[in-house]
Interface confidence: low
């Protein structure tokens, strides 16, 4: 592996090994390796091995590794809203007298208007505005599967609130499924959580635009506040570009072991699109707090350093025991923007735009 | 801000600003800013503003920012197991004939033995071994609150399995609560998910060590396979050291704006504790794939560069639009180890030890 200067691969490995030496001792708060004088002979006790295995084993319910960001995720997503089918539609008739649930139906053709092909969908959220409420209730969301079958999607514990509050459920998989099924009306159900021995199965949560007791008010309910799908998708023309261009590889072990590559605090930086970039084409926002990371992360481990003195520095300066610790963003946030293409305003979400914190890594 | 070389803060800001210029165009797949000739005058249509606000607004149910790792999380955690109270205990008597749930009770004094103070607890998992099953079932976990009250903790959709499978539920908050409540017996309930209009509320999942139909088998069930709490906690003596030493600050805006702190592929590196570190005191594992990151992340944006040529490089080399992109770990995994202190074997989990992938950041 070579850059402007030849990199001594063995030296880098040596430094990494020595850094790991310090890291382990530091994590255990040991100034030196513990003495082995009193260790009993023979294998490890079975209970200890079982405990070790319990800790090591991946089990159902633990979160998997974060997936590397796919190439498509780097690019901006077009954001659209699809409102639920109007409550006056006959499809709601048979759901009227069910006290444990409220129902929402969506027209797949409206969704397809925004997302012509299922793979283009990056994220779909179901957004519901719950009205103020003095009760706590555990609620669930279901997807309509067939005439009499509902698939559980998620749940939420809703605490009392003095003001209306927007709820969001990730329904990306569901919407992708709907898009794969052709046009038609698709349904979702927002229900009370009914426990096995519970008597009160009534849904006490009221949702703007669909709660039965507000039905007479429907004319006055502003469209913007009735349940909707918030869709983020790669526009068709951008997707075609994606397919044709060289794909970015995930920088994981598969790729990196057979490849070559190389090259701490958050600093305040506000970008004013007009002043700093000379741009007038972004209509909202006028600017944003981009920030950036800067500052040294000294490499603080070598064979000739006094162990005990540097252990305390590890946590701050080199927690990852890197051979070349480096100052980088830790938490990043997206930025939604509004701009025009011709006469058409577009809302797009740009991922990883705002640096919130940094780390030595 | 000064390092070995004086850093030109304005130049860094300028580079960051120019990088953002390229980043935004690149994310939108635009070679240059779109023409504004046809943009209608006046404010944005209300619907577009509403969509923009929907995208921008944080709503209930969206995940918050990842918290910076607290200082205590850097250090190793001691791992212990607390088995559920034996099924022969009279406390299980009144739960015998309930078909929708199985019950587990834990002795707080056993938990306190491992975790003397609630804040020392880093993570608690409830582990259950489900037996092979040909049915799919949606199950729920509850915490016992008072005589007749149960608090919902989580759910899981269990698919058919040909082999026994361990399930894990995060119960950190619950166990911390138990530790705050003094000694006694505390309970949890593993139930069928009972939907509001469902007829079949029977729990079809069998759990090793507690499912009713296996009760006669109890003598033959290996203790290791009955439900247990897996606890990870900071040992008391290490915690005292933590309290007394200078705390590491979160590298967030609060701290960093008033402070000074700078430095792409994963490379294979196996650490053999004995050969590479000369250590015999770690009994398990013998070594591990630590890996490391190395490779350039060229800064690929400046005013004199041809826009269209470099846009395609952004995604790979500078997705965060950094002024000094740098090669760092992306996904990290923990490493459990077994070692002795005197005659006493200890199992500890070391966080962020294994580099799985890298990124330019």
């Amino acid at each position: 592996l070579s850059t402007c200067k030849t990199i001594d691969m063995e030296l880098v490995k040596r430094k990494r090994i020595e850094a790991i030496r310090g890291q382990i001792l530091s994590k255990l708060r040991l100034a030196s390796p513990p003495s082995q004088g009193e260790v009993p002979p023979g294998p490890l006790p079975e209970a200890v091995l079982a405990l070790y295995n319990s800790t090591r084993d991946r089990v159902a319910g633990e979160s998997a590794d974060p997936e590397p960001e796919p190439e498509a995720d780097y690019y901006a997503k077009e954001v659209t809203r699809v409102l639920m089918v109007d409550r006056n539609n006959a499809i709601y008739e048979k759901t009227k007298d069910i006290s444990h649930s409220i129902y929402m139906f969506f027209n797949t053709s409206d969704i397809r208007e925004a997302v012509p092909e299922p793979p283009l969908l990056s994220r779909a959220e179901l957004r519901l505005q719950r009205l103020k409420s003095s009760v706590e209730q555990h609620v669930e969301l279901y997807q309509k599967y067939s005439n009499n079958s509902w698939r559980y999607l998620g749940n939420r514990l809703l605490t009392p609130t003095d003001t209306p509050e927007w709820l969001s459920f990730d329904v990306t998989g569901v919407v992708r499924q709907w898009l794969n099924q052709g046009d038609g009306i698709q349904g979702a159900r927002f229900s009370a959580h009914c426990s096995c021995d519970s008597k009160d199965n009534k849904l006490h949560v009221e949702i703007n635009g669909i709660s039965p007791k507000r039905r007479g008010d429907l004319g006055t309910i502003h469209d913007m506040n009735r349940p909707f799908l918030l869709l983020m998708a790669t526009p068709l023309e951008r997707a075609q570009h994606l397919h044709s261009s060289r794909h970015r590889r995930a920088l994981d072990t598969n790729y990196c072991f057979s490849s070559t590559e190389k090259n701490c605090c958050v600093r305040q930086l506000y970008i004013d699109f007009r002043k700093d970039l000379g741009w007038k084409w972004i209509h909202e926002p006028k600017g944003y707090h981009a920030n950036f990371c800067l500052g040294p992360c000294p490499y603080i481990w070598s064979l000739d350093t006094q162990y005990s003195k540097v252990l305390a520095l590890y946590n701050q300066h080199n927690p990852g025991a890197s051979a070349s610790p480096c100052c980088v963003p830790q938490a990043l946030e997206p930025l939604p923007i509004v701009y025009y293409v011709g006469r058409k305003p577009k809302v797009e979400q740009l991922s990883n735009m705002i640096v919130r914190s940094c780390k030595c890594s | 801000l000064s390092t070995c070389k004086t850093i030109d803060m304005e130049l860094v800001k300028r580079k960051r600003i120019e990088a953002i210029r390229g980043q935004i165009l690149s994310k939108l797949r635009l070679a240059s800013p779109p023409s504004q000739g046809e943009v209608p005058p006046g404010p944005l249509p209300e619907a577009v503003l509403a969509l923009y606000n929907s995208t921008r607004d944080r709503v209930a149910g969206e995940s918050a920012d990842p918290e910076p790792e607290p200082e205590a999380d850097y250090y190793a955690k001691e791992v212990t197991r607390v088995l559920m109270v034996d099924r022969n205990n009279a406390i299980y008597e009144k739960t015998k004939d309930i078909s929708h749930s199985i019950y587990m009770f834990f002795n707080t004094s056993d938990i306190r033995e491992a975790v003397p103070e609630p804040p020392l607890l880093s993570r608690a998992e409830l582990r259950l071994q489900r037996l092979k099953s040909s049915v799919e079932q949606h199950v729920e976990l509850y915490q016992k609150y008072s005589n007749n009250s149960w608090r919902y903790l989580g759910n899981r959709l269990l698919t058919p399995t040909d082999t026994p499978e361990w399930l894990s539920f995060d119960v950190t908050g619950v166990v911390r609560q138990w530790l705050n409540q003094g000694d006694g017996i505390q309970g949890a309930r593993f139930s069928a998910h009972c939907s509001c209009d469902s007829k079949d509320n029977k729990l079809h999942v069998e759990i090793n060590g507690i499912s009713p139909k296996r009760r006669g088998d109890l003598g033959t069930i290996h203790d290791m396979n009955r439900p247990f709490l897996l606890l990870m906690a900071t040992p008391l003596e290490r915690a005292q050291h933590l309290h007394s030493s200078r705390h590491r600050r979160a590298l967030d805006t609060n701290y960093c704006f008033s402070s000074t702190e700078k430095n792409c592929c994963v490379r294979q590196l196996y650490i053999d504790f004995r050969k590479d570190l000369g250590w015999k005191w770690i009994h398990e594992p013998k070594g591990y794939h630590a890996n490391f990151c190395l490779g350039p992340c060229p800064y690929i944006w400046s005013l004199d560069t041809q826009y269209s040529k470099v846009l395609a490089l952004y995604n790979q080399h500078n997705p965060g639009a950094s002024a000094s992109p740098c090669c760092v770990p992306q996904a990290l995994e923990p490493l459990p180890i077994v070692y002795y202190v005197g005659r006493k074997p200890k199992v500890e989990q070391l966080s962020n030890m294994i580099v799985r992938s890298c990124k330019c950041s």
Partner: antibody
Framework: LQLVESGGGLVQPGGSLRLSCAAS????????MAWVRQAPGKGLEWVSA????????YYANSVKGRVTMSRDNAKNTLYLQMNSLKSEDTAVYYC??????????????WGKGTLVTVSS | QSVLTQLSSMSGSPGQTVTITCTGS?????????LSWYQQLPGTAPKLLIY???NRASGVPNRFSGSKTGSLASLTITGLQAEDEADYYC???????????FGGGTKLTVL
């Protein structure tokens, strides 16, 4: 939420006046703002609007070139500088909070108004 | 002459339903820009009643409702009460003027 106008009074034709509006009870720096006036016995007339950061301002044709709207977000204060005043500028001037950030899509909260009289 | 046209006065008896109209054009109401309605009681500042065509502002009784067809917007008051006696103004953004415009106002008298 409160909006309190001040700075009104009697002024001669051709003269100048600076109106202020002190805002409290909401995030002023994130709100579009507007000035609306009402001549005695007449209807409402929109005068001007300003975006949250003060980067864009909008004016009615009747006042364009003679008035300047500005804001000081640090002080939570809105201003209307009126020059070359005419007798037809006599009115109660209301400060109002915009429904959206441009201040051009309606006003949800209004001050009590300050009277400007242009007369010799 | 206002860009938005309202009847200058109307009257109704307590308990009745009255509808106040506001006529615009394709550059304002008909252009999809949302309309607001304001109530001004004698001697007081205007108050927002309806925004975005049909959304009631907080604290406004449900006797007040808004609607729109094409370039014609309406404010309907059901179960008229004595305290509803006031001037009512419609307002909307106009893209040809690039300004916000008010209707001339309708004086509602409760008999």
């Amino acid at each position: 939420l409160q909006l309190v106008e001040s700075g009104g009074g009697l002024v001669q034709p051709g003269g100048s006046l600076r109106l202020s509006c002190a805002a409290s009870g909401f995030t002023f720096s994130r709100s579009g703002m507007a000035w609306v006036r009402q001549a005695p016995g007449k209807g409402l007339e929109w005068v001007s609007a300003i975006t949250p950061g003060g980067t864009a301002t909008y004016y009615a044709n009747s006042v364009k070139g003679r008035v300047t709207m500005s804001r000081d977000n640090a002080k939570n204060t809105l201003y209307l500088q009126m020059n070359s005043l005419k007798s037809e500028d006599t009115a109660v001037y209301y400060c109002a909070k915009g429904l959206v950030s441009s201040g051009l899509n309606g006003m949800d909260y209004w001050g009590k108004g300050t009277l400007v009289t242009v007369s010799s | 002459q206002s860009v938005l046209t309202q009847l200058s006065s109307m009257s109704g008896s307590p308990g009745q339903t009255v509808t106040i109209t506001c006529t615009g054009s394709s550059s304002n109401i008909g252009g999809g820009y949302y309309l607001s309605w304001y109530q001004q009681l004698p001697g007081t500042a205007p108050k927002l009643l309806i925004y975005n065509t049909n959304n009631r502002a907080s604290g406004v009784p449900n006797r007040f409702s808004g609607s729109k067809t094409g370039s014609l917007a309406s404010l309907t008051i059901t179960g008229l009460q004595a305290e509803d006696e006031a001037d009512y103004y419609c307002g909307c953004y106009d893209d040809s003027l690039n300004t916000y415009v008010f209707g001339g106002g309708t004086k509602l008298t409760v008999l």
